[in-house]
């Protein structure tokens, strides 16, 4: 009983993981990411850093049941959403600051998954079917990538001293968290 | 291994308020999360709300935003669920949970009862 009342929170189930992190789908109505609400951006900032440690992107943490269809995970988890935009970290005091957002002079910085764990978990299926388990792939961390605009802002460019590895042998898999999905647990994340 | 023990339950009338405390022994991490889940008579356990060990960032179920507040106080290694207007749908007994990121909860209290009279 009860398992009507459950939500598909659209986690993505994986069949095999790959070795390298990649990143996630754009948000739709990414409001931080619009330029002109927000007067576009200032010719210089003082707190202008060209330092990767000076650098850091703002971390929502949320928590969750994983879902397939009726069935649900016996434990929870708690994942990352990696939201919009980065600056200097002596100006994200709390990594969750409100009010307005430091903009680069210089290219466009985004904040994406950095890290994933991959997690086993056990799903509970109603009407007496047998628990399976499944592999998960949760957001562990969060990171600055530079976003060139020669590549019509499609290529990102780690902020890291690593460049970020081609895929080999990776398959093209579905992405099941919609950008709708995503964008529903950003905003509860507030 | 984390131990929980929460405190803090009882009965309330419909609109009033609870403050629950979740104490934590043994390790903790800069990257954990403490949650706060709850079970109704007859339901399967639910998420309330999370809160993040180092940077105080936290989330809550949309059926309590508003209405409860999660804080922590790194000092006591405590965690603490503030619920106010209290309704009898949150009636059930609540459970902390300790996670680091990116995982499952595998670190549960025994949990505490909130029972809301209307």
């Known amino acids: 009983q009860g398992w009507q009342a459950f939500k598909n929170d659209a986690t993505e189930i994986i069949p095999e993981l790959g070795e390298y992190p990649e990143p996630p789908p754009e948000l739709e109505n990414n409001k931080t990411m619009n330029r002109a609400e927000n007067g576009g951006r200032p010719p210089h900032h003082p707190f202008e850093t060209k330092d990767v440690s000076e650098y850091s992107c703002r971390e929502l943490h949320f928590t969750r049941y994983v879902t397939d269809g009726p069935c649900r995970s016996a434990k929870p988890v708690t994942e990352l959403v990696c939201s919009g935009q980065c600056g200097p970290a002596r100006l994200l005091p709390n990594a969750i600051g409100r009010g307005k957002w430091w903009r680069p002079s210089g290219p466009d910085f985004r904040c994406i998954p950095d890290r994933y764990r991959a997690q086993r978990v056990q799903l509970l299926c109603p009407g007496g079917e047998a628990p399976r388990a499944r592999k998960v792939r949760l957001v562990a961390s969060c990171k600055c990538k530079r976003l060139t605009r020669f590549h019509n802002q499609s290529e990102l460019k780690d902020f890291g001293t690593e460049a970020a590895r081609p895929q080999k042998g990776r398959k093209p898999r579905p992405r099941a968290r919609s950008a709708k999905a995503n964008q529903a647990e950003l905003e509860n994340a507030y | 291994e984390v131990q929980l023990v929460e405190s803090g339950g009882g009965l309330v009338q419909a609109g009033g308020s609870l403050r629950l405390s979740c104490a934590a022994s043994g390790r903790t991490f800069s990257r954990d999360v403490m949650g706060w889940f709850r079970q109704a008579p007859g339901k399967v356990r639910e998420v309330v709300g999370s809160i993040t060990w180092s940077g105080g960032s936290t989330y809550y179920a949309d059926s309590v935003k508003g209405r409860f507040t999660i804080s922590r106080d790194n000092a006591k290694n405590t965690m603490y669920l503030q619920m106010n207007s209290l309704k009898p749908e949150d009636t059930g007994v609540y459970y902390c949970?300790?996670?680091?990121?990116?995982?499952?909860?595998?670190?549960w209290g025994q949990g505490t009862q909130v029972t809301v009279s209307s």
């Open positions: 949970a300790v996670a680091e990121l990116g995982s499952t909860y595998n670190d």
